[in-house]
Amino acid sequence: MGSAALEILGLVLCLVGWGGLILACGLPMWQVTAFLDHNIVTAQTTWKGLWMSCVVQSTGHMQCKVYDSVLALSTEVQAARALTVSAVLLAFVALFVTLAGAQCTTCVAPGPAKARVALTGGVLYLFCGLLALVPLCWFANIVVREFYDPSVPVSQKYELGAALYIGWAATALLMVGGCLLCCGAWVCTGRPDLSFPVKYSAPRRPTATGDYDKKNYV
């Protein structure tokens, strides 16, 4: 596959991943009520996200409440907010870096510098994926740990929500896309004879003895 095709595929994956990350960040479904026993008579499901919590009645009526105080939030919610928003913003920066380094754009003159810019874009997307993966895994670890903790009240046990799965899929796309962008950039820099014109040096002047240097002859 050519470097341009790798770049395009990588960028498409990264853009889809970026969209998924924005979706995961905004959805109030990082954790959802776990129904462990048939004898719990409940008419509602609770969803919790980074920005709000929602109560869904059995009738289908949903009521959401945005978290009032940042200081009242748990450490992992505050950290997840910071890291996911940072990942989304970094992916936005990575998009412009990648476009600047893309072979189909003229922002940067063709050459090793352009390939390096493209490589930087790929690395930024890889870093985005890793950055987003931290809060997703941290949050999931807490949810799972509390689910199996016998001290946690039954009605306060939660399961992993859809937002976490969307987030994991998004980070996978960001990292795979980032790798493809890096590969595309590497293909460009790795074959200078194909990518860039070869420069020949002028023959050296004759030596004092009048002989030409032997190494100038093919």
Partner: antibody, heavy 117, light 112 residues
Framework: EVQLVESGGGLVQPGRSLKLSCAAS????????MAWVRQAPKKGLEWVAS????????YYGDSVKGRFTISRDNAKSTLYLQMKSLRSEDTATYYC??????????WGQGVMVTVSS | DIVMTQSPSSLAVSAGETVTMNCRSS????????????LAWYQQKPGQSPKLLIS???TRESGVPDRFIGSGSGTDFTLTINNMQAEDLAIYYC?????????FGAGTKLEL
């Protein structure tokens, strides 16, 4: 030996605040959920509030929700109960308890809180 | 909320006899997930703090004499004291430790 020693009780006027403390020893404090349970004079037991290991999760009984705040300081092995807008029905002996697996396995000697004008 | 109902409220007993008290919950305390019944029994002697005797309906705490036996189904539970001793005179409370709000029964008082 597990020991739970409550302090901070006394006579307080309705509408005022009071903070109870519970000094724990004889076990690794941060490894356990902790709780407050109260008992009105000549009455039964009533669960007040519970708190998770590091204080991330707190749970309250309906009668105290919004008025009482449970907290803990793991470095000092101390449990707290901040009581605001006290009412006469809050008059009780307040017990600090260790709270594994949702039951209460060790209890303090209790501290009396009297709400009266 | 789960309502706990204890019966009888008081019981006249004699040393050496077998004493039985009951506790009923308004909903099942049996968890199909981990196959456990979440009911605890406490003993409170006059002027003292409550003491945990039994958890998970039938698991005796360490140091609790084996004359104390807990049993029961999902909603109906029993605490039996075999060979009643004078030191067993107290109020006995049941508590559901299934879910919040954790609730106690009104107690069964054992009297001579």
């Amino acid at each position: 030996e597990v020991q739970l020693v409550e302090s901070g009780g006394g006579l307080v006027q309705p509408g005022r605040s009071l903070k109870l403390s519970c000094a724990a020893s004889g076990f690794t404090f941060s490894d356990y959920y902790m709780a407050w349970v109260r008992q009105a004079p000549k009455k039964g037991l009533e669960w007040v509030a519970s708190i998770s290991y590091e204080g991330r999760n707190t749970y309250y009984g309906d009668s105290v929700k919004g008025r009482f705040t449970i907290s803990r300081d793991n470095a000092k092995s101390t449990l707290y109960l901040q009581m605001k807008s006290l009412r006469s029905e809050d008059t009780a002996t307040y017990y600090c308890t260790r709270h594994p697996r949702r039951y209460f396995d060790y209890w303090g000697q209790g501290v009396m809180v009297t709400v009266s004008s | 909320d789960i309502v706990m109902t204890q019966s009888p409220s008081s019981l006249a007993v004699s040393a050496g006899e077998t004493v039985t008290m009951n506790c009923r919950s308004s909903q099942s305390l049996f968890s199909s997930g981990d196959q456990k019944k979440f009911l605890a029994w406490y003993q409170q002697k006059p002027g003292q703090s409550p003491k945990l005797l039994i958890s998970l309906a039938s698991t005796r705490e360490s140091g609790v004499p084996d004359r104390f036996i807990g049993s029961g189904s999902g909603t109906d539970f029993t605490l039996t004291i075999n060979n009643m001793q004078a030191e067993d005179l107290a109020i006995y409370y049941c508590q559901q430790h299934y879910d919040i709000p954790y609730t106690f029964g009104a107690g069964t008082k054992l009297e001579l």
